[in-house]
C-alpha cells in the first residue's frame, strides 16, 4: 500500500489504478476510517458520504476537505479494459502545522548556580501532537533532570482535536558573566517538514549576590517566656537559593538538622541562653545573625508594671 499525508482542510484525490478513465467502469471504493467502524463501501451513485468522500467520473476518490476522522485505509478494486482486477491501497494520515511557537513569560536574566526558569515555549494547533525542543546557543539542549529541567504539557482541543504543547525550561547556569541564547523549536516529525523556530532570547547570567543581611526573629517578642511556653526562632535571609541554616546556643552549635526555624516547645530554665543562626551560602560561606537572648521567668518576675505591655510585647497581669 501507499502512505499518503494530507493537510487538514485540504482536498485529497486518490486514484483508482486500472479503472477506465470514463464510464462504464467496474470499480468499488471502500474505506475504514474514524468515520466508520468497519469497512464502508461507497455507492458509485453518490449519497450522504459525498460530503467527505466522493467518487469522481474518472474513478478517483475525492476527499474535499480532509479531517482527523479521515485518517485510515482507502481501497479501490477496479476491473481494467482487459478484464483484469487491479487493487489500490492507501494509508492516509493527516497533519496540521501549528502557528509559530512562542516563548512566553521569558526570564529577564539568570542567576548562576541556582535554578532559573528560562520561559515557557507554547505551540498551538498541531496535529499530530509533535514535539517541542529547546536550544542553547543553537545546540539542542538535552534535559538531564539536574542542570537542565523541562516540564511538558500536552492538551487536545475537545472540538477541533488539535494539540497545544507547552514546555517550561529551567536551567542552572554554571557561571556568571555569560550571555546564553535560548530558542525553542516545534517539529511534527513528518518527512520533508522543517521545524518551526521561536525568536531567540538572549539572557545575561549574573553571579548570585551575597545575602543582603540575616535577621533573627523571635516569638514571643523580646525573648521572655514563662516556663512551659513555646519559643519560635526564625532565621530570615534574602538569599537565593535559600542557604542551609544551623543554630548556635551560647557559642556552641546545636546538633539539629538544618532549618530556618527553631522551635523550643515547653521551655525550661535549661533553654535560657543566647541564640544565633548561621546561614551557609554555596558561593559566599557562612554568615551569622546577631544574637538574641531567651529568658524563662515566672509570670510577673522582672516583668513590666502591672497590666501593661512592655517593650518586649509580653503582657503580664499581677
Amino acid at each position: 500500500g501507499q502512505n499518503i499525508t494530507a493537510r487538514i482542510g485540504e482536498p485529497l484525490v486518490l486514484s483508482c489504478k486500472g479503472a477506465p478513465k470514463k464510464p462504464p467502469q467496474q470499480l468499488e471504493w471502500k474505506l475504514n476510517t474514524g468515520r466508520t467502524e468497519a469497512w464502508k463501501v461507497l455507492s458509485p451513485q453518490g449519497g450522504p458520504w459525498d460530503s467527505v468522500a466522493r467518487i469522481l467520473p474518472n474513478g478517483s476518490l475525492l476527499l474535499p476537505a480532509t479531517g482527523i476522522v479521515d485518517e485510515g485505509t482507502f481501497r479501490c478494486r477496479a476491473t481494467n479494459r482487459r478484464g483484469k482486477e487491479v487493487k489500490s491501497n492507501y494509508r492516509v494520515r493527516v497533519y496540521q502545522i501549528p502557528g509559530k511557537p512562542e516563548i512566553v513569560d521569558p526570564a529577564s536574566e539568570l542567576t548562576a548556580s541556582v535554578p532559573n526558569k528560562v520561559g515557557t515555549c507554547v505551540s498551538e494547533g498541531s496535529y499530530p501532537a509533535g514535539t517541542l525542543s529547546w536550544h542553547l546557543d543553537g545546540k539542542l539542549l538535552i534535559p538531564d533532570g539536574k542542570e537542565t529541567l523541562v516540564k511538558e504539557e500536552t492538551r487536545r482541543h475537545p472540538e477541533t482535536g488539535l494539540f497545544t504543547l507547552r514546555s517550561e525550561l529551567t536551567v542552572i547556569p554554571t557561571q556568571g558573566g555569560t550571555h546564553p541564547t535560548f530558542s525553542c523549536s516545534f517539529s511534527l516529525g513528518l518527512p520533508r517538514r522543517r521545524p518551526l523556530n521561536t525568536a531567540p532570547i538572549q539572557l545575561r547570567v549574573r553571579e548570585p549576590g551575597p545575602p543582603e543581611g540575616i535577621q533573627l526573629l523571635v516569638e514571643p517578642e523580646g525573648g521572655i517566656v514563662a516556663p512551659g511556653g513555646t519559643v519560635t526562632l526564625t532565621c530570615a535571609i534574602s538569599a537565593q537559593p535559600p542557604p542551609q541554616v544551623h543554630w548556635i546556643k551560647d557559642g556552641a552549635p546545636l546538633p539539629l538538622a538544618p532549618s530556618p526555624v527553631l522551635l523550643l516547645p515547653e521551655v525550661g530554665h535549661e533553654d535560657e541562653g543566647t541564640y544565633s543562626c548561621v546561614a551557609t551560602h554555596p558561593s559566599h560561606g557562612p554568615q551569622e545573625s546577631p544574637p538574641v537572648s531567651i529568658r524563662v521567668t515566672e509570670t510577673g518576675d522582672e516583668g513590666p508594671a502591672e497590666g501593661s505591655v512592655g517593650e518586649s510585647g509580653l503582657g503580664t497581669l499581677a
Epitope: G46, G47, P48, W49, S51
Partner: antibody
Framework: EVQLVESGGELVQPGGSLRLSCAAS????????MTWVRQAPGKGLEWVAS????????YYPDSVKDRFTISRDNAKNSLYLQMNSLRAEDTAVYYC????????????WGQGTLVTVSS | DIQMTQSPSSLSASVGDKVTITCRAS??????VNWFQQKPGKAPRRLIY???NLADGVPSRFSGSRSGTDFTLTISSLQPEDFATYYC?????????FGGGTKVEIK
C-alpha cells in the same frame, strides 16, 4: 439563531407545477447541505431531495426523480424546490431542513409549507 | 434500499414511566441514525444525533443507544411535554429513510 422559513405552498391541479422557497438565516448557508422532507396528512416523514453545499450535486428518491428539482442560491441564502407533473400523492407539508449528509443528518427544520394537489 | 422498521407504532404510558422505542435497519448503517420528536402541527425536532449523542437543549432523560443494526431511543422518566410522535432516520445511504414513527400517548 438558525431559522428556516418555507413559502410557496398552495393548492395546485394534478399535472401542474409549483416552486417552493426556503429562506435561511443565522448560519453560514454555503457550509451546509440542504434537504426537503415532506409529510402527507396523517402520515410519516419522507425524504424528497438533497443538495450539497456548492449546489453542484443533487440527490432524489425514485418517487420524485425527473419531476422535482432542488436548487440553491448561496448569495441569497435560499433553497428551492421546483415541482413539476404534480400528483395527488404529492400532497403534503414540505419541510426545509439543514443537512442531509453524514456530518449532520438533519439538525434544524423549518415550520413547513402545505402543498395540496387536487382538482 | 434500506428499511428502518420502527416499533411499536404507538404506545400508551403515564408520566414518570420509562419508554423505549426501537428502530431496526435492514443493513449496516454504522452510527448514522438520528431521532426526532414531532408534535401535532409542528416541525420535527432533533433529539439524538449519530445514534447516541444528545442534541443541544434536549433534556438528559432522552438517550440513544445502538447494538449492531438496532437503535433505541429511551425516555427515562416520561414528562407531560414528551407526549408526541418519534421518528428515527438513517442517513448513511440514499434514499434517506425514516422509520414509520411511534406515537406516545397518555395512558
Amino acid at each position: 439563531e438558525v431559522q428556516l422559513v418555507e413559502s410557496g405552498g398552495e393548492l395546485v391541479q394534478p399535472g401542474g407545477s409549483l416552486r417552493l422557497s426556503c429562506a435561511a438565516s443565522g448560519f453560514t448557508f454555503n457550509n451546509y447541505w440542504m434537504t426537503w422532507v415532506r409529510q402527507a396528512p396523517g402520515k410519516g416523514l419522507e425524504w424528497v431531495a438533497s443538495i450539497d453545499n456548492s449546489g453542484d450535486n443533487t440527490y432524489y428518491p425514485d418517487s420524485v426523480k425527473d419531476r422535482f428539482t432542488i436548487s440553491r442560491d448561496n448569495a441569497k441564502n435560499s433553497l428551492y424546490l421546483q415541482m413539476n407533473s404534480l400528483r395527488a400523492e404529492d400532497t403534503a407539508v414540505y419541510y426545509c431542513a439543514r443537512g442531509g449528509d453524514i456530518t449532520t443528518g438533519f439538525d434544524y427544520w423549518g415550520q413547513g409549507t402545505l402543498v395540496t394537489v387536487s382538482s | 434500499d434500506i428499511q428502518m422498521t420502527q416499533s411499536p407504532s404507538s404506545l400508551s404510558a403515564s408520566v414518570g414511566d420509562k419508554v423505549t422505542i426501537t428502530c431496526r435497519a435492514s443493513q449496516d448503517v454504522g452510527f448514522y441514525v438520528n431521532w426526532f420528536q414531532q408534535k401535532p402541527g409542528k416541525a420535527p425536532r432533533r433529539l439524538i444525533y449519530r445514534a447516541t449523542n444528545l442534541a443541544d437543549g434536549v433534556p438528559s432523560r432522552f438517550s440513544g443507544s445502538r447494538s449492531g443494526t438496532d437503535f433505541t431511543l429511551t425516555i427515562s422518566s416520561l414528562q407531560p411535554e414528551d407526549f408526541a410522535t418519534y421518528y428515527c432516520l438513517e442517513f448513511d445511504e440514499h434514499p434517506l429513510t425514516f422509520g414509520g414513527g411511534t406515537k406516545v400517548e397518555i395512558k
